[in-house]
């Protein structure tokens, strides 16, 4: 058999076959972090665990200083879940006091940074109003989708309030990407 | 053309090319559950439909007795959605009665069992406080991420309360995995 | 090296190797919807952006008139997020007026249409009761799973109420699919 016989008729020479096992992949898990200074209208980025527990990076996908570095151009599936937790939101306190009832919110954004482009690009956003009756609340926001990325792109996860992120368990808050 | 010409320069002989169509894959859908005994601090596992309707298993990925069996080592994307439904949570009843306001919660865990390892590993958890004002509530929890699994590993989905799971439709509650 | 040497022993001639880069893929993003007539018990389908911003279709995956067209049989991962937003749900208004407390809801359905089959098939559903205390609420519903599709199948996203869909940002509401 020649290699040609395994290739479908629309196989192009410029799109080489490659083993699935050598594709860039990462699954990062939550790590404790201290709140940092950030600009008022800019959501802070999360740090991640990249090698302990369930976390890993492989095949030239590297993690450094809050960023996943994309080592190869292509289409990637990117996902994250952030579990938030907090005390009763101000929303219900304001409501009890008879003042205008503007709900609090929790937001997760997966952001792409391209060195050649001045502004970060928001790839995915999950945002939810929080106006809970209970004294303690907790809930996840999950995101996932496919994007065309370029070698050198950097991915990060930003949240509306780091202090509300549940960092207690690696299965509750995570971030990953893999080349399709 | 020789097969070699399709292989990128970093292709290793030990990472063979393989057809995508022969990779282990499964999508399981909800079935009506028979309530089972389980330990107080251990969430019960769900049963699944594996061949009717939208459900399938293929390429040596098998389902047996609540478990998906991993037939081949590699990186898998694993996902599940569980739709919960219930009457007003005790939380709001307790609140109305002026008692301490501890919210109820709903939780989904995707768990890995490895025969050589004494205890299950929680891969993914989605947990949400439920403190609804309405008399009837319903909502999904979705989870999905990539993990490195070994041949022989078993996957299951555990929930905090089987009686709250919506088993009425195969598109509302499901569980799947596929080798990347 | 011959192509044969890259093929694992269970490689079948009828399951040809193929380059990942030439697989059908699409990521569609929200556009402002023009309200359309729809039957009372049938959820309306969303329109999508298919080429501007983050949106793309490639490798014979085409978008036309609310539908993603599947160009090749195989197993696809399909996903969507819809962010909803609204004013206080009737649920709490009804409750305050002392009338029966039926919660409102928001629902997303990913539907498959097969020309040879008379009825659409609901692949995925995310449905949530909305009974918010706050005057303005917003929240996403995310769905994603793997399905075996046939060449010629069409996919669409239906929602319970188009007027509640947040169409303001391409990262909040989206729809995608890719051949595995």
């Amino acid at each position: 058999l020649k290699g040609q016989e395994f290739a479908p008729s629309h196989q192009q020479v410029y799109a080489p076959l490659r083993a699935d096992g050598d594709k860039p992949r990462a699954h990062l898990t939550v790590v404790r972090q201290t709140p940092t200074q950030h600009f008022k209208n800019q959501f802070p980025a999360l740090h991640w665990e990249h090698e302990l527990g369930l976390a890993f990076t492989k095949n030239r996908m590297n993690y450094t200083n809050k960023f996943l570095l994309i080592p190869e151009s292509g289409d990637y599936f990117i996902y994250s879940q952030v579990t938030f937790r907090g005390m009763t939101s101000e929303c219900s306190e304001i409501r009890q006091a008879g003042r205008p009832n503007k709900p609090d919110s929790i937001t997760v954004v997966i952001t792409k940074v391209t060195d050649s482009y001045p502004e970060p690009t928001q790839l995915l956003m999950g945002t939810k109003s929080v106006c809970e009756v209970g004294s303690n609340w907790f809930q996840p926001i999950y995101l996932g989708a496919m994007f065309s990325l370029q070698e050198g792109d950097k991915l990060m996860v930003n949240v509306s309030d780091i202090s509300l992120v549940d960092y207690t368990k690696e299965d509750k808050t995570f971030f990953g990407a893999f080349l399709l | 053309l020789k097969g070699q010409e399709f292989a990128p320069s970093h292709q290793q002989v030990y990472a063979p090319l393989r057809a995508d169509g022969d990779k282990p894959r499964a999508h399981l859908t909800v079935v009506r559950q028979t309530p089972t005994q389980h330990f107080k601090n251990q969430f019960p596992a769900l049963h699944w439909e594996h061949e009717l309707g939208l459900a399938f298993t293929k390429n040596r990925m098998n389902y047996t007795n609540k478990f998906l069996l991993i037939p081949e080592s590699g990186d898998y994307f694993i996902y599940s959605q569980v739709t919960f439904r219930g009457m007003t949570s005790e939380c709001s009843e307790i609140r109305q009665a002026g008692r301490p306001n501890k919210p109820d919660s709903i939780t989904v865990v995707i768990t890995k069992v490895t025969d050589s390892y004494p205890e299950p590993t929680q891969l993914l958890m989605g947990t949400k406080s439920v403190c609804e004002v309405g008399s009837n509530w319903f909502q999904p929890i979705y989870l999905g991420a990539m993990f490195s699994l070994q041949e022989g590993d078993k996957l299951m989905v555990n929930v905090s309360d089987i009686s709250l799971v919506d088993y009425t439709k195969e598109d509302k509650t499901f569980f799947g995995a596929f080798l990347l | 090296l011959k192509g044969q040497e890259f093929a694992p022993s269970h490689q079948q001639v009828y399951a040809p190797l193929r380059a990942d880069g030439d697989k059908p893929r699409a990521h569609l993003t929200v556009v402002r919807q023009t309200p359309t007539q729809h039957f009372k018990n049938q959820f309306p389908a969303l329109h999508w952006e298919h080429e501007l911003g983050l949106a793309f279709t490639k490798n014979r995956m085409n978008y036309t008139n609310k539908f993603l067209l599947i160009p090749e049989s195989g197993d696809y991962f399909i996903y969507s997020q819809v962010t909803f937003r609204g004013m206080t749900s009737e649920c709490s208004e009804i409750r305050q007026a002392g009338r029966p407390n039926k919660p409102d809801s928001i629902t997303v359905v990913i539907t498959k249409v097969t020309d040879s089959y008379p009825e659409p098939t609901q692949l995925l559903m995310g449905t949530k009761s909305v009974c918010e205390v706050g005057s303005n609420w917003f929240q996403p519903i995310y769905l994603g799973a793997m399905f075996s599709l046939q060449e010629g199948d069409k996919l669409m996203v239906n929602v319970s109420d188009i007027s509640l869909v947040d169409y303001t940002k391409e990262d909040k509401t989206f729809f995608g699919a890719f051949l595995l």
């Epitope: 790590v31 972090q33 201290t34 090698e51 527990g53 809050k66 | 205890e119 590993t121 | -």
Partner: antibody, heavy 124, light 107 residues
Framework: QVQLVQSGAEVKKPGASVKVSCKVS????????VHWVRQAPGQGLEWMGV???????DYNSKFQGRVTMTRDTSTNTVYMELSSLRSEDTAVYYC??????????????????WGQGTLVTVSS | DIQMTQSPSSVSASVGDRVTITCRAS??????LAWYQQKPGKSPKLLIY???SLQDGVPSRFSGSGSGTDYTLTISSLQPEDFATYFC?????????FGAGTKLEIK
Amino acid sequence: QVQLVQSGAEVKKPGASVKVSCKVSGFSVTSYNVHWVRQAPGQGLEWMGVMWSGGNTDYNSKFQGRVTMTRDTSTNTVYMELSSLRSEDTAVYYCARAGRYYHDSNYYWDFPYWGQGTLVTVSS
Amino acid sequence: DIQMTQSPSSVSASVGDRVTITCRASEDIYSGLAWYQQKPGKSPKLLIYGASSLQDGVPSRFSGSGSGTDYTLTISSLQPEDFATYFCQEGLKSPYTFGAGTKLEIK
């Protein structure tokens, strides 16, 4: 949940060796780092070394040549052996699972999970 | 190796008192400092990491502050269960040195 259970108390003669075990549950020793810390009676805590998740080890230079850390992945157990014992080695020996945390752009290690301790008495 | 100097070595206080313990590093540890509580016959318990972040489940009466080489643990209103020995630990580099400890006793 995470637990580290250590072997029982030991009495040893000077010059002998002692091997303390730390059986963990709730995590795998191939996925997390297990450290050893000792505490002499009425004294402070002293870091001895670490068994990294990948199987490598690092030791405090003070104990270099006398301490050996090993593990058995099949039983999820880490061992610390200290040789050429002297009376000043009398202490409670703890295993601990390290945790990583970030401040600004740097990461640091602390010890959120500890074993119950093993008293080793060195006496002639 | 980084040296950690803790003071005082012991302190007597009453329930309801505010107590402060300090820890000085021999070089800048960039807020890579943790505080532990240890009761007799028990293992240490992590209270604070990153100089000022409260570990999950630790009461809010415990707080930490400091930067560079100087760090402080404060207990705002002592409770009976707080009488114990407290240790600081640098997490920047091996050998992850601990302070000698501060014994908090009932006056």
